[in-house]
C-alpha cells in the first residue's frame, strides 16, 4: 500500500494528477463508522469542506483526496478530520515550465560517484494500475529502453551519464489523458570513497580516578582502511612502564569504512599520571583528529563542572 502523505509542506506542478493520503488510514475499522471530513482554507476562505460537488477535479476515496489534475488555484491549506484526529498540509502549486519537459523547482538531485552503481527506475505505485505507458527522457530526449511500463537504467556510472532524467507516466482517467513527471538531476563526481576520519565522543574528557588503581581509556574512531589510530603520551619525559596500549580492534561498517577502538591502560595510577594530557589521534593523508583525556583525583571532582566528566 502507498504510504501516507506525512510531509506537512508540499510543492506540486500544475496540470498533474496529485493526491493527499492521511496517516490514520490504518485504523480501517474506525474509518467505516466514523465521520470523516476534508477541508481547505486559502486567503479569505476559512475551512471550506471539500466534496466531489466542490469541483469536478476532486475525488474522495477512503483515506485519499485526489486532484484530476491539480491546478494553481488549489494552493492552500488542507485538513483531514476524523473524531479527535486532525492532519494538516500546506500545498503550493507551481507553474509548469512550458518550454521544457520538466519544471526546475521539482527536481530531485542525486550525486553518483564515477564507476559506482547507478540506477534510475521509473515507478509510481499509487497510480500504477492507471498507467498506460511510461517514458524515460534524458535532458528531454526520449531514451529507447525495452520496458515501457517501468523503464530502468542500471549501470556503472560514467561522466557522460550526468544530466536530467525525467520519468513521464501517461495515464487515463475518466476519458482524459494525464501525465506525471518525476525528474532527477544526476551529477557524476570523482571517487569520494575516503572519508575524513573522526574520533567519536567529546574532545576533552576528565576521568575521575583513585591513586593505586587502574584505568582503561577507550578511544573509538570511524576511519578509512589505511588510516591509523594511536595514543600520544609521555613524549617529553619518556615512557611510563605502567602505561600500555592495547591491541586495536577494528570492524568494517556496512558502508565499507572501519570502526576502530584502541584502549590505553594505566596501571597503579600515581601522582605523575594526574592532570596530564593523554591524547588519542586518528590520522589519514587528509589530516588528523585528536581527543584528550585528563585523569583527575576523585576528591578533586567538585572543582570541575559535571558536564566534562567521563565515567
Amino acid at each position: 500500500a502507498e504510504s501516507c502523505t506525512s510531509r506537512p509542506h508540499i510543492t506540486v506542478v500544475e496540470g498533474e494528477p496529485f493526491y493527499l493520503k492521511h496517516c490514520s488510514c490504518s485504523l480501517a475499522h474506525e474509518i467505516e463508522t466514523t465521520t470523516k471530513s476534508w477541508y481547505k482554507s486559502s486567503g479569505s476562505q476559512e475551512h471550506v469542506e471539500l466534496n466531489p460537488r466542490s469541483s469536478s477535479r476532486i475525488a474522495l476515496h477512503d483515506c485519499v483526496l485526489e486532484f484530476w489534475p491539480v491546478e494553481l488555484n488549489d494552493t492552500g491549506s488542507y485538513f483531514f478530520q476524523m473524531k479527535n484526529y486532525t492532519q494538516k498540509w500546506k500545498l503550493n502549486v507551481i507553474r509548469r515550465n512550458k518550454h521544457s519537459c520538466f519544471t526546475e523547482r521539482q527536481v530531485t538531485s542525486k550525486i553518483v560517484e564515477v564507476k559506482k552503481f547507478f540506477q534510475i527506475t521509473c515507478e509510481n505505485s499509487y497510480y500504477q494500475t492507471l498507467v498506460n505507458s511510461t517514458s524515460l527522457y534524458k535532458n528531454c530526449k526520449k531514451l529507447l529502453l525495452e520496458n515501457n511500463k517501468n523503464p530502468t537504467i542500471k549501470k556503472n556510472a560514467e561522466f557522460e551519464d550526468q544530466g536530467y532524467y525525467s520519468c513521464v507516466h501517461f495515464l487515463h482517467h475518466n476519458g482524459k489523458l494525464f501525465n506525471i513527471t518525476k525528474t532527477f538531476n544526476i551529477t557524476i563526481v570523482e571517487d569520494r570513497s575516503n572519508i575524513v576520519p573522526v574520533l567519536l565522543g567529546p574532545k576533552l574528557n576528565h576521568v575521575a580516578v583513585e591513586l593505586g588503581k587502574n584505568v582503561r581509556l577507550n578511544c573509538s574512531a570511524l576511519l578509512n582502511e589505511e588510516d591509523v589510530i594511536y595514543w600520544m603520551f609521555g613524549e617529553e619525559n619518556g615512557s611510563d612502564p605502567n602505561i600500555h596500549e592495547e591491541k586495536e580492534m577494528r570492524i568494517m561498517t556496512p558502508e565499507g569504512k572501519w570502526h576502530a577502538s584502541k584502549v590505553l591502560r594505566i596501571e597503579n595510577i600515581g601522582e605523575s599520571n594526574l592532570n596530564v594530557l593523554y591524547n588519542c589521534t586518528v590520522a589519514s593523508t587528509g589530516g588528523t583528529d585528536t581527543k584528550s583525556f585528563i585523569l583527575v583525583r576523585k576528591a578533586d571532582m567538585a572543582d570541575i563542572p559535571g558536564h566534562v566528566f567521563t565515567r
Epitope: D227, V228, Y230, M232, E235, E236, G238, S239, T281, A283, S284, T285, G286, G287, T288
Partner: nanobody
Framework: EVQLVESGGGLVQPGGSLRLSCVAS????????MGWYRQAPQAPGKQREL??????????IYATSVKGRFTISRDNAKNTVYLQMDNLKPDDTAVYYC?????????WGQGTQVTVSS
Amino acid sequence: EVQLVESGGGLVQPGGSLRLSCVASGSISSINGMGWYRQAPQAPGKQRELVARITSGGSTIYATSVKGRFTISRDNAKNTVYLQMDNLKPDDTAVYYCNIYGGALWPWGQGTQVTVSS
C-alpha cells in the same frame, strides 16, 4: 608529494636481528614526529599498529610488545628513519612501514616484509 621507501626486511630466525631503513623523498627535519608502523598478516583491512615513534628532539616511545627489543632513530640530514629490531619473535612477523606520527600522514610506501620463523 613525498614518497617513502622502506627497506631492510627479510626472513630471520627467532632471536635474530634486522635493521630497517626508511628514506623520504622530501625533508623530514621539519616533521616533529616520525614512526614505524606494522601490518600483521592477520590484521583486518590494512590495520597498522604504531610500534615506535621518535620526536624531532629525539624522545622515543615504544609499543609494549616491542619495548626493550626495538630502537628507533632518525637522521634528518639523510631524511632517513631507522628501526633496529633485536631478539625478534614470530609475533613480529608483519609488513613494516614508516610515516609521520602526530600529524597528517604522507602516502604510504610499499613497506618491507619481516618474517620471523624457524
